[in-house]
């Protein structure tokens, strides 16, 4: 029951997280005009990953897309890439995790397969969350750098007569949405990985232990306590779960069919 709850909660948390990552990626307010310690303007500028917008006091808002690809800063391209990879991995993870849910029965799918799928989706959620957090953090770092650079030469005087105030940008709402969403996706992924361990419990076989009342020797047959690593020799006994303590090689090789993402 606890495993089902952990898996279900992990799925829901990841779902909310990925929805948040998608929302953050689409939002226009990644960076917003810094209003602190600046002259009050009748224009408010804000920028997203895909377009920049200007909201006038009049009520009009005008947004213009970044129609160039090569002319954009490499950092912005990197952030876009990280967010998209996060969304794609998260979406695939959601798809896999739906079939992995213990409460959903699909044909005669065994628990070992469900455990594998749960672990796979968990890893995908973790990577997805990390991608989003990394993307948002890279953008935030870019903003901080630009902020202090523009503060250093905030007033660029023309012969000391005319002053041009540079527009400074600060953190927009999308950054906070992205951080929270990335964190939720990460937490959801960890929960899925924990649930996977519960789905594939350690198999303990108490077999053929012979007690001799008269003697002091206890005979243990070699197949007694068996760790379910998937490499066990005792394969003619009960089905061994694959999803428990698996080797690193196995964990990494399973999602290799998604390496093109």
């Amino acid at each position: 029951m606890a495993v089902t709850a952990c898996q279900g909660l992990g799925f829901v948390v990841s779902l909310i997280g990925i929805a948040g990552i998608i929302a953050a990626t689409c939002m226009d307010q990644w960076s917003t005009q810094d209003l602190y310690n600046n002259p009050v303007t009748a224009v408010f500028n804000y920028q997203g990953l895909w377009r920049s917008c200007v909201r006038e006091s009049s009520g009009f808002t005008e947004c213009r897309g970044y129609f160039t690809l090569l002319g954009l800063p490499a950092m912005l391209q990197a952030v876009r890439a990280l967010m998209i990879v996060g969304i794609v991995l998260g979406a695939i993870g959601l798809l896999v995790s739906i079939f992995a849910l213990k409460c959903i029965r699909i044909g005669s799918m065994e628990d070992s397969a469900k455990a594998n799928m749960t672990l796979t989706s968990g890893i995908m959620f973790i990577v997805s969350g990390l991608c989003a957090i990394a993307g948002v953090s890279v953008f935030a770092n870019m903003l901080v750098t630009n902020f202090w650079m523009s503060t250093a030469n905030m007033y660029t005087g023309m012969g000391g007569m005319v002053q041009t105030v540079q527009t400074r940008y600060t953190f927009g709402a999308a950054l906070f949405v992205g951080w929270v969403a990335g964190g939720l996706t990460l937490i959801g992924g960890v929960m899925m990985c924990i649930a996977c361990r519960g789905l594939a419990p350690e198999e303990t076989n108490y077999k053929a232990v012979s007690y001799h009342a008269s003697g002091h020797s206890v005979a243990y047959k070699p197949g007694g306590f068996k760790a379910s690593t998937g490499f066990g020799s005792n394969t003619k006994n009960k089905k061994i779960y694959d999803g428990g303590a698996r080797t690193e090689d196995e964990v990494q090789s399973y999602p290799s069919k998604h390496d093109y993402v």
Epitope: T41, A42, V43, S52, V165
Partner: antibody, heavy 118, light 113 residues
């Protein structure tokens, strides 16, 4: 057709109060920022106050800060300017204006005359 | 506050003549976000409220004759009337629409010779 009609002007003594109204029609009142602009006899226009479409942002000219209050009632399509502690230099024609692109004052009313005199 | 300086204060012209008037702001009115200059030109005739002619320094308001042209960027702006008509005799004001307070220039009065 956009129409702005000001009312509430008149003769008032220094230190007195007055409330101007501006009835708007012909456009979505709650979609636009609005402003009050005044023009003293034989002088240029002077911006007095601004209010955003939702009344979230409000700005005043330094000369009227603390004495004038701009407000709006979107349900009634009406803009207000409450004036107190009036001075002789507040004597002017008061216009209500609807903002347009570029924060320009795209539409103006015909104005209401406010005279502050003893 | 942003100071808007208009010159000349008055212009005496003949019909059909080309007229140019200047407006200078104490700070740049160029918004980096959309690369637009938040400067507006108005025309005011006696007994009437001002009428919007040009916004964003160079965008003509609908219904305004194309003989009116706005130009300039940053701090220096110009209003040009290619061929003055009798109905153009009025006072022309420029306005800063970027910084609060939204200040007006003192105006340029266009008079007939």
């Amino acid at each position: 057709e956009v129409k702005l009609v000001e009312s509430g002007g008149g003769l008032v003594q220094p230190g007195g109060s007055l409330k101007l109204s501006c009835a708007a029609s012909g456009f979505g009142f709650s979609d636009y920022g609005m402003a009050w602009v005044r023009q003293a006899p034989r002088k240029g226009p002077e911006w007095v106050a601004f209010i955003s479409n939702s009344a979230y942002s409000i700005y005043y000219a330094d000369t009227v800060t603390g004495r004038f209050t701009i407000s709006r009632e979107n349900a009634k399509n009406t803009l207000y300017l409450e004036m107190s502690s009036l001075r002789s230099e507040d004597t002017a024609m008061y216009y209500c204006a609807r903002l347009g692109r570029g924060n320009s004052f795209a539409y103006w009313g015909q104005g209401t005359l406010v005279t502050v005199s003893a | 506050d942003i100071v808007m300086t208009q010159s000349p204060s008055s212009l005496t012209v003949t019909a059909g003549e080309k007229v140019t008037m200047s407006c200078k702001s104490s700070q740049s009115l160029l918004n980096s976000g959309n690369q637009k200059n938040y400067l507006t030109w108005y025309q005011q005739k006696p007994g009437q409220p001002p009428k919007l002619l040009i916004y964003w320094a160079s965008t003509r308001e609908s219904g305004v004759p194309d003989r009116f042209t706005g130009s300039g960027s940053g701090t220096d702006f110009t209003l040009t009337i290619s061929s003055v008509q009798a109905e153009d005799l009025a006072v022309y004001y420029c306005q800063n629409n970027y910084y609060y307070p939204l200040t007006f220039g003192a105006g340029t009065k266009l008079e007939l010779k």
